[in-house]
Interface confidence: low
């Protein structure tokens, strides 16, 4: 049979902690599309038991042979059928787990029923919350049978299925009429293709006699061993907390396999791990019972004691399932020379010994560096050796050093020294670093300096909204990679902490210091469009735009105008910091340049969609500056300006522009057009008496040219006349004192 196990964690008080893990012991299982074959699949099967839609479940792959399903948010998410598919080609196998709600009206006395062809199957639904209505039995989602509510026997509704055949296999349910399907009792019936003890195409071959509750596979005759047992006939017990065809897997968590349901390939079905029983696999076996679901009885002989995980533990000189078989200087076997554990853990150390008389649990002891002697808490007795398991008290740093395993029997004694290294779990010394942020995600560099011992095996990032009392969200990341925290709230501060782990049980260090990381604003979604633009000079452009009208407040802090000069390959960006603005003056542009122009809304650091672009051609630059500008006061209100035309003109001058400003004044300058470009002088009238003025001027062809030098002159005092002739031009007159 394929080595495939589906584990369900039955911590039902908190669905968010519930998880399903599919573990494959097959070589190269789950590596995907390479030569090793197809990956492991783990999914909820909604074909028969449908539950209300909820948030999608999270699937996490841990290496090549393990996949875990999490993300259950409410108890109803758990109810139903889950399946794991693994193995390649003809060995592709589906393992099924059926989950019942602990609060259902009806509960199955036993969820998985494996029966032989021709047997009578009896499904028993126990009344948990009574309703005085009929009970509907369904098979694979279809109506099968109805029982009147009076037909309950001893608080149970029974469905008898005589002479079952393989097509009868499937999911059965018992539901009160008009009750929620989630309150049903769900069962799984597995009908072997052969009668008891037989296998093969015509059921002609005899099964090997599977021990410890193993089930003979009707296709290949192999024993599908219960969790915690191994061997061709399931004759050998694994160490406590181990499972898989070679006992190679270990139950997660500090409670071993407590609270875990194990599902194996058909025809085994599901059960608790060895040593546990009950609907939630949280009850230890009663004395004298052992194995999966505690279904086996020890019946130990010759002074053997019953271990709920492995069965009979035989005294010296005896072995066999019931210590019924009678059996040199003792010898320590296969002791590792060096072991490593984490500080404050309580590891189990195994020491195996053989000899005649056969070593028993009490004859093997473990000695710590300080001389303390530990006695084993459990022993697994096999025909050729006894393996004593020692539960070491919580390790401290002083426990580092040489330990010794010693076996003593009446035949003599043997000992073996080995080195134990106690390592300190790593603790971050700094907070994680924020790399980039968006409105709904943060990219974080999690690896920081730490105290304690490496190597770092896993990095956990814990995060939650600042000042929140909600549970921390946790993400396990590769130590060498940056991590993206997804599905966050915009514009929200998050407290983020790192927890580092080193290899081995108890390798998780304390949480590092928190840091505050804030998500960005929501992205602005409105697309502006350009209403128009107006050239206000060879280097000046006024732009106006609009936004679509939408209900609600505007999401935006301002606008970004972008001008692209394709000839020079240069981009100019202008920030308009008011979201109410709809116009902007762009200055300092390059005359005679063809620009591509667009505008977009921004919010915090995020840009919205850009408007459709506009193409704008600025006029070329104007003429050089007029030469030799000179000013002379004519009266208390008039000053005459004279100049020479600019040299090297690119074309005919259309006008001159004079700038007039009171010296030291705070007001804006006044511009006056001189519309007769052939003139080289003009009189500025309407000035104030005894006032000092500044003048400069420039010429215009297609665009305004460079400014001339600035000249100063004062108007005369009242009643004084300047000497010499007066030459007037038709310059526009305007008083500066209005």
């Amino acid at each position: 049979a394929v080595d495939l196990t589906l584990l369900a964690n039955l911590r039902l008080t908190d669905p968010q902690r519930f998880f399903l893990t599919c573990v494959s012991g097959e070589a190269g299982a789950g590596r995907g599309s390479d030569a090793w074959g197809p990956p492991l699949l783990l999914e909820k099967d909604d074909r028969i038991v449908r539950t209300p839609p909820g948030p999608p479940l999270r699937l996490a792959r841990n290496g090549s042979h393990q996949v875990t399903l999490r993300g259950f948010s409410k108890p109803s998410d758990l109810v139903g059928v889950f399946s794991c598919v693994g193995g390649a080609g003809a060995r592709r196998t589906r393992v099924i787990y059926v989950h019942n709600s602990p609060g259902a009206h009806l509960l199955p006395d036993k969820v998985t029923h494996t029966v032989n062809k021709g047997d009578t199957a009896v499904l028993s639904a126990r009344v948990h919350k009574e309703k005085q209505t009929d009970v509907i039995w369904k098979s694979n989602g279809s109506y099968f049978y109805t029982l009147d509510w009076h037909e309950a026997q001893d608080g149970r509704f029974l469905l008898q299925l005589p002479n079952v055949q393989p097509p009868s296999s499937g999911i059965y349910s018992a539901t009160y009429l008009e009750a929620s399907p989630l309150g049903s009792a769900f069962f799984r019936l597995i009908v072997r293709g052969c009668g008891a003890g037989r296998w093969g195409p015509g059921c002609t071959k005899e099964c090997p006699g599977c021990l410890h509750g193993g089930v003979c596979h009707d296709h290949d005759g192999e024993c599908v061993c219960p969790p915690g047992f191994t061997g061709t006939r399931c004759e050998q017990a694994c160490r406590e907390g181990r499972f898989g065809q070679s006992c190679q897997e270990q139950c997660p968590g500090i409670s071993g396999c407590r609270g875990l349901t194990f599902c194996l390939p058909d025809p085994y079905g599901c059960s608790c791990g060895s040593g546990w029983r009950g609907s939630q696999c949280q009850e230890a076996c009663a004395p004298g019972h052992f194995g999966a679901d505690c279904r086996l009885q020890c019946q130990c002989q010759n002074g053997g004691t019953c271990d709920r995980f492995s069965g009979c533990v035989c005294p010296s000189g005896w072995h066999g399932v019931h210590c019924e078989k009678s059996d040199r200087i003792p010898q320590i076997l296969n002791m590792a020379s060096e072991l490593e554990f984490n500080l404050e853990t309580m590891p189990r150390i195994n020491c195996a010994a053989a000899g005649n008389p056969f070593p028993v649990r009490g004859s093997i002891e473990l000695r710590k560096p300080d001389g303390t002697v530990l006695l084993s808490t459990k022993a697994i007795v096999e025909p050729e050796k006894t393996t004593a398991e020692f539960e070491v008290p919580r390790l401290v740093l002083a426990d580092s050093g040489f330990w010794e395993c010693r076996v003593s029997t009446s035949g003599g004694q043997d000992s073996r020294r080995f080195k134990v290294n106690v390592k300190v779990p790593p603790v971050p010394l700094a907070a994680p670093r924020l790399l980039t942020k968006q409105s709904r995600q943060l990219v974080v560099s999690p690896l920081v300096s730490f105290s304690g011992d490496g190597p770092i095996s896993t990095v956990r990032l814990h995060y939650r909204p600042q000042d929140s009392t909600m549970d921390w969200s946790t993400i396990v990341v590769d130590p060498s990679e940056n991590v993206t925290l997804m599905n966050l709230r915009p514009k929200t501060g998050y407290s983020v902490r790192v927890q580092l782990s080193r290899p081995g049980e108890g390798g998780e260090g304390a949480w590092g210091p928190p840091t505050l990381m804030t998500t960005d604003c929501p992205e602005p979604l409105l697309q502006p469009w350009l209403e128009g633009w107006h050239v206000e000079g060879t280097d000046r452009l006024r732009v106006s735009w609009s936004l679509p009208l939408v209900p609600g407040p505007l999401v935006g802090d301002g606008f970004l105008l972008r001008l692209w000069d394709g000839t020079r390959g240069q981009e100019r960006r202008e920030n308009v910091s008011s979201p109410q603005a709809r116009t902007a003056l762009l200055t300092g542009l390059t005359p005679g340049t063809h620009y591509q122009l667009d505008v977009q809304l921004y919010h915090c650091t995020l840009l919205g969609p850009a408007s459709p672009p506009a193409h704008v051609l600025l006029p070329p630059s104007g003429p050089p500056a007029p030469r030799h500008l000179h000013a002379q006061a004519l009266s208390d209100s008039e000053i005459q300006l004279t100049w020479k035309h600019p040299e090297a003109l690119p074309g005919p001058i259309s006008k001159y522009v004079v700038e007039v400003q009171v010296a030291g004044g705070a007001g804006d300058p006044l511009w006056i057009d001189v519309d007769r470009p052939e003139e080289t002088s003009t009189i500025i009238r309407g000035l104030n008496a005894s006032t000092r003025y500044l003048f400069r001027m420039r010429a215009s062809i297609q665009g305004l040219g460079d400014w001339s030098n600035t000249v100063e002159e004062s108007t005369l005092g009242n009643g004084l006349q300047a000497e010499g002739p007066v030459q007037e031009s038709r310059a526009a007159e305007e008083g500066l004192d209005q």
């Epitope: 008080t13 500080l343 919580r394 740093l397 002083a398 304690g452 921390w472 304390a510 949480w511």
Partner: antibody, heavy 117, light 110 residues
Framework: EVQLLESGGGLVQPGGSLRLSCAAS????????MMWVRQAPGKGLEWVSR????????QYADSVKGRFTISRDNSKNTLYLQMNSLRAEDTAVYYC??????????WGQGTMVTVSS | QSELTQPPSASGTPGQRVTISCSGS????????VNWYQQLPGTAPKVVIH???QRPSGVPDRFSGSKSGTSASLAISGLQSEDEADYYC???????????FGGGTKLTVL
């Protein structure tokens, strides 16, 4: 005889500082996780801080984080609690305790800290 | 506010059996062993039960502890006057990354 003896308590004004000591004897001090636990007058027990045998790892309750510092001197078999920025709500009997598999098997007799103006 | 919940008081007559409950969460009692402390008036606490049901040497066998799921209880049979004290439950809390104490139960021997 295995025992723990606290000292250093007293009356201090809000915002002030105190340093508590806990002298250990009768066991290998350097091998154990040590704790400080406090009990406000008429109230229940509250964990304050915890330190690993080497002193390299420390843990604090949220209520004292950033204000209190736990430390140890294994050569002197002594545990310390440096308390800064004291508040009225820090008024309590402070016990040191030995932590064995997260059970506190040995306790000192306690030292009273009163924060009042 | 305590992370573990205990009744504030309990009482019984000499010779009676009394039980004190302690309720926690999946991250505290659900995952970790429970310890019980006795605090006689004016003295430091003393552990009477550790690791759910283990009695330290010197503690009478009248004291017993048990745990189921996210709850635990301390039972005292054959109640005696010297048992009058405050009793606190405690368990490591994985979400706090520290120990959590119950608020305490004052046991009165009538």
């Amino acid at each position: 005889e295995v025992q723990l003896l606290e000292s250093g308590g007293g009356l201090v004004q809000p915002g002030g500082s105190l340093r508590l000591s806990c002298a250990a004897s009768g066991f290998t001090f350097s091998s154990y996780v040590m704790m400080w636990v406090r009990q406000a007058p008429g109230k229940g027990l509250e964990w304050v801080s915890r330190i690993y045998p080497s002193g390299g790892i420390t843990q604090y309750a949220d209520s004292v984080k950033g204000r209190f510092t736990i430390s140890r001197d294994n050569s002197k078999n002594t545990l310390y609690l440096q308390m800064n920025s004291l508040r009225a709500e820090d008024t309590a009997v402070y016990y040191c305790a030995r932590d064995v598999y997260r059970a506190f098997d040995i306790w000192g007799q306690g030292t009273m800290v009163t924060v009042s103006s | 506010q305590s992370e573990l919940t205990q009744p504030p008081s309990a009482s019984g007559t000499p010779g009676q059996r009394v039980t004190i409950s302690c309720s926690g969460s999946s991250s505290s009692i659900g995952l970790n062993p429970v310890n019980w402390y006795q605090q006689l008036p004016g003295t430091a606490p003393k552990v009477v039960i550790h690791s759910n049901d283990q009695r330290p040497s010197g503690v009478p066998d009248r004291f017993s502890g048990s745990k189921s799921g996210t709850s635990a209880s301390l039972a005292i049979s054959g109640l005696q006057s010297e048992d009058e004290a405050d009793y606190y439950c405690a368990a490591w809390d994985d979400s706090l990354n520290g120990p959590a104490f119950g608020g305490g139960t004052k046991l009165t021997v009538l």
